[in-house]
């Protein structure tokens, strides 16, 4: 997260880290005791999932292996549409005040809505500085019409933009797949943006979760 702040401890109990060994690979969000939602471009053969801590690599955090993941069947490595994936944990999480599932959206929030994005991604760009603490950034949803002024046809129908006018605050390497939460519901998953990260008036681009609720519910049901 560029130009963000340290999240209030315990305020993001649904935030998970997808680790490759001990190294941060992507962010993710707990949606059920067996399931984590993340970006399709974060696909790996297997995952080590850290839950219940704001510190990356925290020895006291829950760590659960995941060997199955389900990309959206329409994910395109060319256009990056449908950049969403469900990861099934090999064992259920132990829910607590530190580990909770996020609320999936009932509706799509409108432009102008205040949201928070979080992650352990680099805080500097292009040179990287990975924080140990979970970082947050407060951003607002931007209309597709406004966002298309920047990204033109790169912006798909199920992509969502967020940012703050004239501000550098944005997501970056390592934040991928992490949650954009608006009014206590999951509205976005970090997908992409311009580089170096934090160029003012280049919004962050997210997968718009409200458009995938049915796919999420059906996939979890199918692979119970």
């Amino acid at each position: 997260i560029i130009d963000g702040y340290k999240c209030k401890e315990g305020s993001h109990p649904w935030q998970v880290a997808l680790l490759k060994g001990n190294q941060l690979h992507c962010g993710g969000v707990l949606v059920d005791k067996y399931w984590v939602l993340t970006a399709a471009h974060c696909k790996m053969g297997q995952y080590q999932v850290q839950l219940g801590s704001d510190k990356i690599g925290d020895q006291s955090a829950q760590k659960i292996k995941a060997t199955k993941s389900f990309r959206h069947p329409g994910y395109s490595t060319k256009t990056h549409v449908n950049d969403i994936m469900l990861v099934r944990l090999d064992e259920p999480v132990k829910m607590s005040s530190k580990v909770e599932a996020v609320q999936l959206p009932e509706h799509c929030e409108p432009p102008g809505t205040s949201c928070t994005v979080s992650g352990w991604g680099t805080t500097t760009s292009p040179d990287v500085t990975f924080p140990s603490d979970l970082m947050c950034s407060d951003v607002k949803l931007i209309s597709s019409r406004e966002c298309k002024k920047v990204y033109k046809d790169l912006l798909g129908k199920t992509m969502l933009c967020a940012g703050i006018p004239d501000s550098k605050t944005n997501t970056c390497n390592g934040d991928s797949g992490g949650p954009l939460v608006c009014n206590d519901t999951l509205q976005g998953l970090v997908s992409w943006g311009t580089y170096p990260c934090g160029q003012p008036n280049d919004p962050g681009v997210y997968t718009q979760v409200c458009k995938y609720k049915r796919w999420v519910m059906e996939t979890m049901k199918t692979h119970r």
Partner: antibody
Framework: QVQLVQSGAEVKKPGSSVKVSCKAS????????ISWVRQAPGQGLEWMGW????????NYAQKLQGRVTMTTDTSTSTAYMELRSLRSDDTAVYYC???????????????WGQGTMVTVSS | DIQMTQSPSSLSASVGDRVTITCRAS??????LNWYQQKPGKAPKLLIY???SLQSGVPSRFSGSGSGTDFTLTISSLQPEDFATYYC??????????FGGGTKVEIK
């Protein structure tokens, strides 16, 4: 300071295969894509394809589809490009390049290997 | 696929000259255009990304402009070390990445 270090020059017979390596020394490329670009003698640059070090997803140039395979070994921060059924017009310098970006998109090549000369001759 | 056309394919100039190279895309690529410099026997080197942003460590005599389909690389005062071949590429509709044919800058 990260550098991309490629394997040495190769001389190959038509119909054979070549595998070129590209190692990130002094760092990793786990947040990037690695692209392969070739340049025939006296010619311009030709993009061959790339592999996401995030996911292993690949995209290949249409004209090379079926003959090229790109892989990475993240434990050694090494990328590989294998080209099969070599022909004389595959004679070129092969470069690996780091595609800078974050998340699903990559925008430009900010770091290049030194190049590997592959000569295909009977 | 988007085609990139560079002009001229070669030019002769003297040290101190202002040099302009153009790159035209077959369709709009917004500002997603990059410029590279390549010297004989060496790998290309990134000069400009996003049409006008100077890569770290690149001298300020290099500048880029344009958006949509027409782009320009300008060297404000040519130095001896600038004699090289220059390539553009587009990163808008990718893959594939498409490069221009190159412009060779030679000593007059």
């Amino acid at each position: 300071q990260v550098q991309l270090v490629q394997s040495g020059a190769e001389v190959k017979k038509p119909g054979s295969s070549v595998k070129v390596s590209c190692k990130a020394s002094g760092g990793t490329f786990s947040n990037y894509a690695i692209s392969w670009v070739r340049q025939a003698p006296g010619q311009g640059l030709e993009w061959m394809g790339w592999i996401s070090a995030y996911s292993g997803d690949t995209n290949y140039a249409q004209k090379l589809q079926g003959r090229v395979t790109m892989t990475t070994d993240t434990s050694t921060s090494t990328a590989y490009m294998e080209l099969r059924s070599l022909r004389s017009d595959d004679t070129a310098v092969y470069y690996c390049a780091r595609a800078a970006g974050y998340g699903a998109r990559h925008w430009y090549f900010d770091l290049w290997g030194q190049g590997t000369m592959v000569t295909v001759s009977s | 696929d988007i085609q990139m056309t560079q002009s001229p394919s070669s030019l002769s100039a003297s040290v101190g000259d202002r040099v302009t190279i153009t790159c035209r895309a077959s369709q709009s690529i917004s500002s997603y255009l990059n410029w590279y410099q390549q010297k004989p026997g060496k790998a290309p080197k990134l000069l400009i990304y996003g049409a006008s942003s100077l890569q770290s460590g690149v001298p300020s005599r290099f500048s880029g402009s344009g958006s949509g389909t027409d782009f320009t690389l300008t060297i404000s005062s040519l130095q001896p070390e600038d004699f090289a071949t220059y390539y553009c590429d587009q990163s808008y509709s990718t893959p594939p990445i498409t490069f221009g044919g190159g412009t060779k800058v030679e000593i007059k």
